[in-house]
Interface confidence: medium
């Protein structure tokens, strides 16, 4: 599935990413933008042999299990192929996890390199929340 | 126990396309990559590409982009390989196998004869 | 493309003998390199994963070091049902690629 942004913002919001940890939904919204394009499907391979899934670009090597990640954590302990469904539960329950590690949204590349610091409330504005 | 089953060996002739399947037991389908690799005699083995059944992701070796299309049907634990443009380079033996890194579980294997 | 350069192309042996079957990467592959048997007209077999993991039901005589790029899998008294092709596969980057086999045959 593809969300529209405020059709996403509005899904997040209900799955309690409003300012959890003190992200505010425009940063969820952004991250989703730049990693997946909204894509739940996208999946994306990482030269170590690892692969990203979701439309928040879970990884392999760590929070979840798709069976052929040498050494893989599986923190979030779910099959990485739940991410890819068009419901986010899955892919939100294990985000929350992720950004409880320690270093907040700068696990996300994209968020770091291209929502932090900028204007993020940009992408809610007109969204019907 | 995990096994794959493929289809039946064909013959076909040049230009034409074919689809071989793959049929999985044993194991939650949607949750393994799919991984199909092609043999033939004096090349070895040689990897075409593959398919998460559970979202359809897939990904080609270059070589084979544009001959090889990978679907599945979750429905039925079953996923296949559309082979288009047949030419005589084509004729080999198709493997489909479980993505673990390594693969522990293969087919036992397709034989595609493309004759005029 | 890692390629998989496996030597020698062909082994002659004598049953009791010992063996060792060399894979080279062209570039670092760590430890995700992984080995298999092959009879005529049958599927691959998995026999190592990881340089040296056991895949399950390999009998003992079968194992696997290296670590980088040079990798070898030793067979420790060659039995009959032992003869046949034998491949390596790196897992480390996309696309997969297989070395161009080995094969063990009786002298």
């Known amino acids: 599935k593809v969300f529209g942004r405020c059709e996403l913002a509005a899904a997040m919001k209900r799955h309690g990413l409003d300012n959890y940890r003190g992200y505010s939904l425009g940063n969820w919204v952004c991250a989703a933008k730049f990693e997946s394009n909204f894509n739940t499907q996208a999946t994306n391979r990482n030269t170590d042999g690892s692969t990203d899934y979701g439309i928040l670009q879970i990884n392999s090597r760590w929070w979840c299990n798709d069976g052929r990640t040498p050494g893989s954590r599986n923190l979030c302990n779910i099959p990485c192929s739940a991410l890819l469904s068009s419901d986010i539960t899955a892919s939100v329950n294990c985000a929350k996890k992720i950004v409880s590690d320690g270093n907040g949204m700068n696990a996300w590349v994209a968020w770091r390199n291209r929502c932090k610091g900028t204007d993020v409330q940009a992408w809610i504005r007109g969204c019907r929340l | 126990q995990v096994q794959l089953q493929e289809s039946g060996a064909e013959v076909m002739k040049p230009g034409a396309s074919v689809k071989i399947s793959c049929k999985a037991t044993g194991y939650t389908f949607s949750t393994y990559w799919i991984e199909w690799v092609k043999q033939r005699p004096g090349h070895g083995l040689e990897w075409i590409g593959e398919?998460?059944?559970?979202?359809?992701?897939?990904y080609y070796n270059e070589k084979f982009k544009g001959k090889a299309t990978f679907t599945a049907d979750t429905s039925s634990n079953t996923a296949y390989m559309q082979l288009s443009s047949l030419t005589s380079e084509d004729s080999a033996v198709y493997y489909c196998a479980r993505g673990d890194g390594w693969y522990g579980y293969w087919g036992q294997g397709t034989t595609l004869t493309v004759s005029s | 493309d890692i390629e998989l350069t496996q030597s020698p192309a062909t082994l002659s042996v004598t049953p009791g003998d010992s063996v060792s079957l060399s894979c080279r990467a062209s570039?670092?592959?760590?430890?995700?390199l992984h080995w298999y048997q092959q009879k005529s007209h049958e599927s691959p077999r998995l026999l190592i994963k990881y340089v040296s993991q056991s895949s399950s039901g390999i009998p003992s005589r079968f194992s696997g070091s290296g670590s980088g790029t040079d990798f070898t899998l030793s067979i420790n008294s060659v039995e009959t049902e032992d003869f046949g092709m034998y491949f390596c596969q790196q897992s480390n980057s996309w696309p997969r690629t297989f070395g161009g086999g080995t094969k063990l045959e009786i002298k």
């Open positions: 398919i998460l059944p559970g979202s359809g992701s897939t």
């Open positions: 570039q670092s592959i760590s430890n995700n």
